[in-house]
């Protein structure tokens, strides 16, 4: 996160760290807990690393440096990448992770509510992006979970800023015209959440941007509301019943 500040314990209890253990262990992506056994993240996090057993998912943590060999983590039972995601495109950058064992909810580890299907009418004015990613383009992974308040921008405005790309209605953009605040490398897959009527909702999944926090280059996020049918289909067909946090 560029231009962010430290988060507090329990402030973003749905935020998880997706880490890979090969020879060493490192944080690669963020994710959002959406049910006892489900994490929503970005499909591109798994490019070149589709093997389930190399991944470790840490939930209920604030500081990555607190992780030791004794810190509990979740393992992956199944990775479900959107069927239309292609490595050669930036579309449908969304994936579900089914955990091997369900997680208990605590003050520091609980799910984020999902938006209503095709939610286009809600005007979100209080949106935040969180993650342990770089604090500048040529930076490094941060120890303490960072947060930053970023306004949404219209898809029309976003398309103007990214003429070489196709900004679809299944994407949502956020950023300041002057730059300075944005997600960055290592924040991929993490949440863009907005508070509406006193409730936090998962509006976007951190997907891509041209550099980080550059002027007139907003961050681009996968629009969760556009994938609600897919999320419900995959979680229900796997579970037999839905266990998602839907909005009240």
């Amino acid at each position: 996160i560029v231009g962010g500040t430290n988060s507090s314990w329990g402030e973003w209890p749905w935020q998880v760290s997706l880490q890979v253990k090969l020879t060493a262990q490192r944080h690669l992506c963020g994710g959002s807990l959406i049910g006892h056994q489900w994490v929503l993240t970005a499909a591109h996090c798994f490019d070149g690393l589709p093997l389930q057993d190399v991944w470790r998912i840490y939930s209920g943590i604030l500081n990555l440096s607190d992780i030791t060999k004794d810190t509990p983590f979740s393992q992956i039972k199944e990775i479900i990448i959107h069927q239309n995601y292609k490595v050669s495109e930036g579309n449908h950058d969304i994936a579900l992770i089914k955990l091997q064992a369900p997680l208990n909810y605590t003050e520091f580890q609980k799910p984020i509510c999902l938006p209503s299907k095709g939610d286009t009418s809600t005007i979100y004015t209080n949106c935040w992006v969180t993650g342990w990613g770089f604090s500048k383009e040529k930076g490094e992974i941060q120890n303490i979970l960072q947060k930053v308040n970023i306004p949404l921008v219209t898809n029309e405005e976003c398309q103007k800023r990214y003429q070489d790309y196709k900004i679809t209605q299944r994407m949502v953009c956020a950023g300041y015209k002057e730059g300075g605040k944005d997600a960055c490398k290592g924040d991929s897959g993490g949440p863009l959440v907005c508070k509406h009527n006193g409730m936090w909702r998962l509006v976007g999944i951190t997907s891509w941007g041209e550099g980080c926090a550059r002027r007139e280059q907003p961050g681009v996020y996968t629009k969760v509301a556009e994938y609600m049918d897919w999320i419900l289909e995959k979680t229900q067909s796997s579970d037999g019943k839905a266990q998602m946090q839907s909005p009240a």
């Epitope: 490595v87 050669s88 495109e89 070489d164 196709k166 997600a183 924040d187 991929s188 891509w208 041209e210």
Partner: antibody, heavy 125, light 108 residues
Framework: EVQLLESGGGLVQPGGSLRLSCAAS????????MTWVRQAPGKGLEWVSY????????IYADSVKGRFTISRDNSKNTLYLQMNSLRAEDTAVYYC??????????????????WGQGTLVTVSS | DIQMTQSPGTLSLSPGERATLSCRTS???????LAWYQQTPGQAPRLLIY???SRATGIPDRFSGTGYGTDFTLTISRLEPEDYGTYYC?????????FGQGTRVEIK
Amino acid sequence: EVQLLESGGGLVQPGGSLRLSCAASGFTFSHYLMTWVRQAPGKGLEWVSYISPSGGHTIYADSVKGRFTISRDNSKNTLYLQMNSLRAEDTAVYYCARVARGIAARQRTSYYDYWGQGTLVTVSS
Amino acid sequence: DIQMTQSPGTLSLSPGERATLSCRTSQFVNSNYLAWYQQTPGQAPRLLIYGASSRATGIPDRFSGTGYGTDFTLTISRLEPEDYGTYYCQQSSRTPWTFGQGTRVEIK
């Protein structure tokens, strides 16, 4: 299966014009940035021009700026290169290529993942 | 413009040998925008490596790419007969997009 098929090459006199076409199939053409690359006989590869998915944004190499025009018709899945005021140094095999733009670590990637077989343009009197 | 300088110009090696091809750029290039292509006579170029180190679909694991910033390397661990040809590095970080002049890998 992704396919790119160029046509329109041939022999033309200096100062003449030619229009190359590239017919695309096997993918959603309107989602991809497309490019032209050329290769003079016995020489290396030279990027010529690219066009955004919508066709609204184009960029050219200095060597062809003001003489060549790239365009596309997404309804016909076809890319074009209109070449005017041709010179002997424009003699080359012209390739069209699809520009893949995936995502890696929150940044976009860019590379030419599929190429046509090329069409030869010879500028000579 | 970003200049791409490949070395050596020609590499004469026997099958089974290791080939190391270098590509230097005149300015910093984001690794995501660095690719390698192979071209054999009479054929269109073929994508080998993108993002400086990711193998394209169907490319055997004897091909590997490394590098960061201004220095990039393509390695062929054990040359096979079909690997002979010309190899180009290319950047699309900044326009004009540019290619290296190529390294020809020939049979010794």
